[in-house]
């Protein structure tokens, strides 16, 4: 049977094409450095196909190697703001289950007002990813300035 | 029939592997903030497999979720140049059809001379992507410093 | 035969899913600007599925278009350190075979302490990728701050 037909017959999820792109919903209360995310077609260009949101954090549904990417822009910022409020740091990590807790990606703003990066990492079903923004500066909720996503790449 | 055989028999386009990587051709005239791109094997390592160029702007040929990425480096730049000429901003968006016009990705240079980012976004056949560089500084045309690309990820 | 079954029967390598994510091992001796990488499950979250390491440099095993990504963070760094030691530059390129030598991706640190970028590029079996860090500042070996990877995207 040709792959083109198989593609039409099998649900996309069985091909392992899990993918999500999220927009910022809000920051946590004062002692909680986590960013809280939201996604779905009603919200614009964000979506979840496979992964799910659990209280604003992204939970993985399929084992595999994922490309994780993020961009965060500070709401009020100039190069001097960023350096005066240093360190302002963004870290993406697995925050649960606790046994798998690890930092995957970390960047500081220094004299910039935006950080953007990406990496490949193995993730397992049930892993929850948290994005921690430490410091006093608030991130922008503009959907073209702040976003977070994952793409399943291979088993 | 084995997938390996199917891969050989079916044209790659039917597998949905649309992809493009472009290099800077030129900037627009004074009132036009758009960057104009070029691609093809004769130009080096740039290419278009599926998407097309329409007057230097990238037009999508297949509906789906795409990874869009860009890097732009300013040509004559130091951290003091960048801050003195602030705001210099790069925005990637859908510029036509007008009904779908939206900014997808936005970054400011602040005290840096390079911006680089990527995001997942749904695109539709016929969407044209524009990259607007606002400010007085010129981008480098070096192919390892300034480039723009898309990769089809899933339907 | 269903693709889901084909997926299980065929080795992943035949599907063209070559992928690698590396962590920094060490820098080169004084006159060698190359970064030396390492990867494998024993080292944490780094891995090589298809590509191989040759004396700390990444060698490609399958022709195709790849997404190449990198993040490098300087070890002891502030915005003033970075600007005082300018230029500190990171370049990713094909360093062998010599006939295919070319710079693929280049970024300067200016007043920042981290660079991160990604691009699509054609690579051929036998291409070896080198990452050259020029300047006097040392990179961090923290696995969430400095990493380098490739992902096969299409033939």
């Amino acid at each position: 049977q040709r792959f083109a037909q198989a593609q039409q017959q099998l649900p996309l999820e069985s091909l392992g094409w899990d993918v999500a792109e999220l927009q910022l919903n809000h920051t946590g209360p004062q002692q909680d450095p986590r960013l809280y995310w939201q996604g779905g077609p009603a919200l614009g260009r964000s979506f979840l196909h496979g992964p799910e949101l659990d209280k604003g954090q992204l939970r993985i549904h399929r084992d595999g190697i994922y490309m994780v990417h993020i961009q965060v822009t500070l709401a009020i910022c100039s190069s001097t703001t960023a350096s005066r409020h240093h360190p302002t740091t963004l870290a993406v990590g697995i925050c649960s289950p606790a046994s798998r807790s690890i930092s995957l990606l970390r960047l500081s703003f220094h004299q910039g007002c935006t950080i953007a990066s990406q990496r490949l990492t193995p993730l397992a079903r049930g892993d929850t990813l948290c994005t921690n923004l430490t410091g006093t500066l608030l991130p922008s909720r503009n959907t073209d300035e702040t976003f977070f996503g994952v793409q399943w790449v291979r088993p | 029939q084995r997938f390996a055989q199917a891969q050989q028999q079916l044209p790659l386009e039917s597998l949905g592997w649309d992809v493009a990587e472009l290099q800077l051709n030129h900037t627009g005239p004074q009132q036009d903030p758009r960057l104009y791109w070029q691609g093809g094997p004769a130009l080096g390592r740039s290419f278009l497999h599926g998407p097309e160029l329409d007057k230097g702007q990238l037009r999508i040929h297949r509906d789906g979720i795409y990874m869009v990425h860009i890097q732009v480096t300013l040509a004559i730049c130091s951290s003091t140049t960048a801050s003195r000429h602030h705001p210099t901003t790069l925005a990637v968006g859908i510029c036509s059809p007008a009904s779908r016009s939206i900014s997808l990705l936005r970054l400011s240079f602040h005290q840096g001379c390079t911006i680089a980012s990527q995001r997942l976004t749904p695109l539709a056949r016929g969407d044209t992507l524009c990259t607007n560089l606002t400010g007085t500084l010129l981008p480098s045309r070096n192919t390892d410093e300034t480039f723009f690309g898309v990769q089809w990820v899933r339907p | 035969q269903r693709f889901a079954q084909a997926q299980q029967q065929l080795p992943l390598e035949s599907l063209g899913w070559d992928v690698a994510e590396l962590q920094l091992n060490h820098t080169g001796p004084q006159q060698d600007p190359r970064l030396y990488w390492q990867g494998g499950p024993a080292l944490g979250r780094s891995f090589l599925h298809g590509p191989e390491l040759d004396k700390g440099q990444l060698r490609i095993h399958r022709d195709g278009i790849y997404m190449v990504h990198i993040q490098v963070t300087l070890a002891i760094c502030s915005s003033t350190t970075a600007s005082r030691h300018h230029p500190t530059t990171l370049a990713v390129g094909i360093c062998s075979p010599a006939s295919r030598s070319i710079s693929l991706l280049r970024l300067s640190f200016h007043q920042g302490c981290t660079i991160a970028s990604q691009r699509l590029t054609p690579l051929a079996r036998g291409d070896t990728l080198c990452t050259n860090l020029t300047g006097t500042l040392l990179p961090s070996r923290n696995t969430d701050e400095t990493f380098f990877g490739v992902q096969w995207v299409r033939p």
Epitope: Q23, N25, H26, T27, P29, Q30, Q38, A42, L43, G44, S46, A75, T136, L138, R141, T143 | - | -
Partner: nanobody, 119 residues
Framework: EVQLVESGGGMVQAGGSLRLSCAAP????????MGWYRQAPGKQRELVAL???????NYADSVEGRFTISRDNAKNTVYLQMNSLKPEDTAVYYC?????????????WGQGTQVSVSS
């Protein structure tokens, strides 16, 4: 269309003070942040101060230490106290609200109030 209503602008000598007020309809007082943008002639609009729903504040470098943003929940009002004003603070000041909404967010603006600082 929800409108934010600003007041308090005017003319003042350098070194003087003004207090801007922004009244918001009660139904939008669940916000990510409320803040004040300003736009001087020929310049881009810039965000100069914001206050979050839980009272955190951020300021632009140019106004930090001189301007103070605050809110009165009972009156659904946000204030911008501007001290030690400088000629370069001359601009139209706009109240802004980034509001939680069913569609992710809504953004609301005031009509603007002119602040003129003479030397």
């Amino acid at each position: 269309e929800v409108q934010l209503v600003e007041s308090g602008g005017g003319m003042v000598q350098a070194g003087g003070s003004l207090r801007l007020s922004c009244a918001a309809p009660g139904k939008i007082f669940s916000f990510y942040f409320m803040g004040w943008y300003r736009q001087a002639p020929g310049k881009q609009r810039e965000l100069v101060a914001l206050i979050t729903g839980d009272g955190r504040t951020n300021y632009a470098d140019s106004v930090e230490g001189r301007f103070t943003i605050s809110r009165d929940n009972a009156k659904n009002t946000v204030y911008l106290q501007m001290n030690s004003l400088k000629p370069e603070d001359t601009a139209v000041y706009y109240c802004y609200a980034d509001v939680f909404a069913r569609a992710g967010r809504d953004e609301y603006w005031g009509q603007g109030t002119q602040v003129s600082v003479s030397s």
